[in-house]
């Protein structure tokens, strides 16, 4: 067992039948010492008296919150929390696989810049009592610095009969230097809580491989005489690193249909404008990469050819 | 401690085009490390970074764009000197700042060159003949130190008595290819802003 | 499985015209670019121009600019293509290739020589 | 027009050995670069696209490298069949231009 945070507790647990379970022994948090009684949840039923309470945490309906009460007062909680180890491994119930870029990937994140900001999310398909706390460092053996915010519900889909919920949080390194090569990973935690179950998920990984640039902005068109060809230009996004001459972008440019079997012409170019061939219903899109470390493309930016 | 803005014409910096060739043929070499040695730990994940030139140079520092000396993170208490000559310093005007950054790395080029080829060696000892450092990539290095041109103490190639360890030979140069990877994208970096600035 | 047929081998005299088709079959025909290629003997390949059948749109090499006509019939799914003025050095294989993608080739036809002599 | 120069021209290799061609561009092109495989009496097929991707179908040995100006295509262990003329092409602008070809022959 041990403590999450003031007053709730895990209990580790093998899970298989006829698992003994755990001994747990909870202390009442009183100067008092006589005329205790124990209560599990909205329950009436005394369990126990005395200033501790010995316990056998087998499964769901031993966990709870455990309240200590003298004449009718209450003198402290405990909230016990099960964590649960099937076959050696930690249960993950609550959130969904995501399965890219390999399978057990339950948490991905993404960085938009070298800043040391950087987003993570994940997707269950529990809509009530549930709740998440996330930690990060940098490094584990000798953690450096890095704030999370609090976990957010950031969307909702439905997928088929059922609905699943997005939920992200947004960390920051707290001393990062952009230009920085990076040999200590960070580390993400997630605490998840459903009900009375705990797990807990973690990530890691370098900035530089979840960078993933913002889309590029103010893409132009400008039709050449004489020609089916198009001169179409962009600007880096607003919120790529800089100086741009030292973080450089590639980019992808492409005019397709709106099918993705349809022919297309693309052309990849380090430079911030192209000559492409406009065709009638089509659209000219570009995406952005860093140019040096190759990682994740940025989406699309379009524009109609017409 | 940075580099200045004033720095020498866009196309007269022979290193840029030397650099590029580095990050490319160092990407070939890690490519085809995690290909060939498969079953050993060589993706980035499983292998520990190690930066051999850590405390001898410091590249990252040395070579700061100007932009980023507003950063308190970014500048680190390291300064190191080095001599001052380099051929890439197209511009007499070029201030000892770039001299520097220039130099430094030269010198994380000669280290990784030195240990690449004591590798190297060591490889070709291998009865499994499983891998070999790829000649492109240390000619690319060659050639970029040509270009660069700095006046250095030669670095004696290590030479080991003792049998080599081959499954350690090999972890090695998985860590070696790595982190040379991440300064080759440093240095590419590096390279494109001098030559836009 | 895509292919693409070619017409059969020609001998024109200079000054003269010649057209090529190429009949494709495997796939429809609109949904690809259609290019000529040619390879003089023991030469390289050198690049004609394209054309679009779905809307008949073509760009040319500056090359053979006003002397290359490209053409598509989607009825026949038959792309031609039409050189005139000919001389002896537009003796050569001529190919047509095709591609969902614009600016290179992952299909060829067999090739047609054409001969330029008096 | 941009020109694209292979080298060499004529590439003798022994069977089972590696073989690299090279391709140089005369402007920078990024990745825009496609190489073909020709032997004699039939038409050009696609190896590789975009500098580095390859095709469905192509064995696994040939493999290309390369961005900006310099590009290698590399054939890991020749094989009796892989002995025929190589082409690199340009897509980054029109027109479209192709390399002299390198013709790999038995050694």
């Known amino acids: 067992i041990w403590e999450l945070k003031k007053d709730v507790y895990v209990v580790e647990l093998d899970w298989y039948p006829d698992a003994p379970g755990e001994m747990v022994v909870l202390t009442c948090d009183t100067p008092e010492e006589d005329g205790i009684t124990w209560t599990l949840d909205q329950s009436s039923e005394v369990l126990g008296s005395g200033k501790t309470l010995t316990i056998q945490v087998k499964e769901f309906g031993d966990a709870g919150q455990y309240t200590c009460h003298k004449g009718g007062e209450v003198l402290s909680h405990s909230l016990l929390l099960l964590h649960k180890k099937e076959d050696g491994i930690w249960s993950t119930d609550i959130l969904k696989d995501q399965k890219e870029p390999k399978n057990k990937t339950f948490l991905r994140c993404e960085a938009k810049n070298y800043s040391g900001r950087f987003t993570c999310w994940w997707l269950t398909t529990i809509s009530t009592d549930l709740t998440f706390s996330v930690k990060s460092s940098r490094g584990s053996s000798d953690p450096q610095g890095v704030t999370c915010g609090a976990a957010t519900l950031s969307a909702e889909r439905v997928r088929g009969d059922n609905k699943e919920y997005e939920y992200s949080v947004e960390c920051q390194e707290d001393s990062a230097c952009p230009a920085a090569e990076e040999s200590l990973p960070i580390e993400v935690m997630v605490d998840a809580v459903h009900k009375l179950k705990y797990e807990n998920y973690t990530s890691s990984f370098f900035i530089r491989d979840i960078i993933k640039p913002d889309p590029p902005k103010n893409l132009q068109l400008k039709p050449l005489k004489n020609s089916r060809q198009v001169e179409v230009s962009w600007e880096y996004p607003d919120t790529w690193s800089t100086p741009h001459s030292y973080f450089s972008l590639t980019f992808c440019v492409q005019v397709q249909g709106k099918s993705k079997r349809e022919k297309k012409d693309r052309v990849f170019t380090d430079k911030t404008s192209a000559t492409v061939i406009c065709r009638k219903n089509a659209s000219i899109s570009v995406r952005a990469q860093d140019r040096y470390y190759s990682s994740s493309w940025s989406e699309w930016a379009s524009v109609p050819c017409s | 401690r940075n580099l200045p803005v004033a720095t020498p014409d866009p196309g007269m910096f022979p290193c840029l085009h030397h650099s590029q060739n580095l990050l490319r043929a160092v990407s070939n070499m890690l490519q085809k490390a995690r290909q060939t040695l498969e079953f050993y730990p060589c993706t980035s994940e499983e292998i520990d970074h190690e930066d051999i030139t850590k405390d001898k140079t410091s590249t990252v520092e040395a070579c700061l764009p100007l932009e980023l000396t507003k950063n308190e993170s970014c500048l680190n208490s390291r300064e190191t000197s080095f001599i001052t000559n380099g051929s890439c310093l197209a511009s007499r005007k070029t201030s000892f700042m770039m001299a520097l950054c220039l130099s430094s790395i030269y010198e994380d080029l000669k280290m990784y060159q030195v240990e690449f080829k004591t590798m190297n060696a060591k490889l070709l000892m291998d009865p499994k003949r499983q891998i070999f450092l790829d000649q492109n990539m240390l000619a690319v290095i060659d050639e970029l130190m040509q270009a660069l041109n700095f006046n250095s103490e030669t670095v004696p190639q290590k030479s080991s008595l003792e049998e080599p360890d081959f499954y350690k030979t090999k972890i090695k140069l998985c860590i070696l290819l790595h982190a040379f990877r991440i300064r080759a994208v440093t240095i590419d970096r590096v390279m494109s802003y001098l030559n836009a600035s | 499985q895509v292919q693409l047929v070619q017409s059969g081998a020609e001998v024109k005299k200079p000054g003269s015209s010649v057209k090529v088709s190429c009949k494709a079959s495997g796939g429809t025909f609109s949904d690809y670019y259609l290019h000529w290629v040619r390879q003089a003997p023991g030469q390289g390949l050198e690049w004609m121009g394209w054309i679009d059948p779905e809307n008949g749109d073509t760009e040319y090499a500056p090359k053979f600019q006003g002397r290359v006509t490209i053409t598509a019939d989607e009825s026949t799914s038959t792309a031609y293509m039409e050189l005139s003025s000919l001389r002896s050095e537009d003796t050569a294989v001529y190919a047509c290739?095709?591609?969902?993608?614009?600016?290179?080739?992952?299909?060829w036809g067999q090739g047609t020589l054409v001969t330029v002599s008096s | 027009d941009i020109v694209m120069t292979q080298s060499p021209l004529s590439l003798p290799v022994t069977p089972g050995e590696p073989a690299s061609i090279s391709c140089r561009a005369s402007?920078?092109?990024?990745?825009?670069l496609h190489w073909y495989q020709q032997k004699p009496g039939q038409a050009p097929r696609q190896l590789i696209a975009f500098a580095s991707q390859s095709i469905s179908g192509v064995p696994s040995r040939f493999s290309g490298s390369g961005s900006g100006t310099d590009f290698t295509l590399t054939i890991s262990s020749l094989q009796p069949e892989d002995f025929a003329t190589y082409y690199c092409q340009q897509s980054n602008s029109f027109p479209l231009t192709f390399g002299q070809g390198t013709k790999v022959e038995i050694k």
């Open positions: 290739a095709r591609n969902k993608e614009l600016r290179y080739f992952d299909v």
């Open positions: 402007q920078s092109i990024s990745i825009n």
